[in-house]
């Protein structure tokens, strides 16, 4: 039975040209995290594998920095980066947990962080 929950940074906004940290946290389970995939729709941004470390997709290798922790720092933001991002936790023995973050990249300096929320 999957008992864990994923807490994410929720809906967030950031300024064009700036950077943002995408962060998820898996709680309420003793399952072992074997890999975390960061995706935008079906497109890979990066993978953090427990044994192998980080792999950054070619499409993002010049503007994605691993971390902090299992999170991801997305740099040099453009308005095209607006959209949904998913953290996919591969765990044993539970299986897969998915968290969602919505990022809005703004032209002006009105960017604010949204509230944190949980996805079961």
């Amino acid at each position: 039975m999957m008992t864990g929950t994923i807490e994410t940074t929720g809906n967030i906004s950031a300024e064009k040209g700036g950077s943002i940290i995408l962060q998820c946290h898996l709680s309420s389970t003793t399952a072992q995290v074997t890999q975390v995939n960061w995706e935008q729709q079906d497109q890979l941004l990066a993978i953090c594998n427990a044994d192998l470390g980080w792999h950054i997709s070619p499409s993002f290798k010049d503007r994605v920095a691993p971390g902090p922790g299992l999170g991801l720092t997305l740099q040099s933001l453009t308005v095209n980066d607006t959209g949904e991002y998913f953290c996919i936790y591969h765990t044993y023995p539970d299986g897969t947990y998915t968290g969602r973050i919505f990022l809005e990249v703004l032209e002006s300096s009105v960017a604010e962080h949204g509230a944190r929320f949980q996805i079961p």
Epitope: Q35, Q43, L44, I47, N49, L52, S57, P58, S59, H90
Partner: antibody
Amino acid sequence: QVQLQQSGGEVMKPGASVKISCKATGYTFSNYWIEWVKQRPGHGLEWIGEILPGSGSAYYNEKFRGKATFTADKSSNTAYMQLSSLTSDDSAVYYCARQKYGNYYYFDYWGQGTTLTVSS
Amino acid sequence: DIQMTQTTSSLSASLGDRVTISCSASQGISNYLNWYQQKPDGTVTLLIYYTSSLHSGVPSRFSGSGSGTDYSLTISNLEPEDIATYFCQHYSKLPYTFGGGTKLEIK
């Protein structure tokens, strides 16, 4: 030494499905992506997509999404590509190759190729 | 998608010649370019990665250069075993795309 041994050629009827295999030897299977590449005369080489055998994470060239499905069996060090709803456009030589996990963006060893002929 | 163009689809050269094969990208790819060799029997091998780094086991007569959108592979002293088709491939972003290939023949 590193080897990627692919299954033999196939002759299939339009509308059918086919599963091509790629058996890896001489290295740690889970430490490398398996890449799939299509070659048709006059069309050069086309990247179909990739799978990370350890986790089963698979990513596809949009052009082949819905056409190709990747799987991997860690116990036999074998990757598979299934092609569905075959048409004459799928007649080609298909290669598997490996790419090291991490920031290594080249295919350093290739299989010998599998020829697929789709004909009624 | 980024288009990779190898304008010369085939070329003939004599043994011992210096041969240069060109490849251009539809936009700048920041040296994110690899070269592969495909023998007549279909065998594919990696020659050069990241524009100019020689893959292990590849003879030193092979070299790569370029920047921006224009790249080249040079064979400094053509040997009989170099008869093959050569493909460039970018990895600036997904999807990876390949050039159409340049078939090298002996005069």
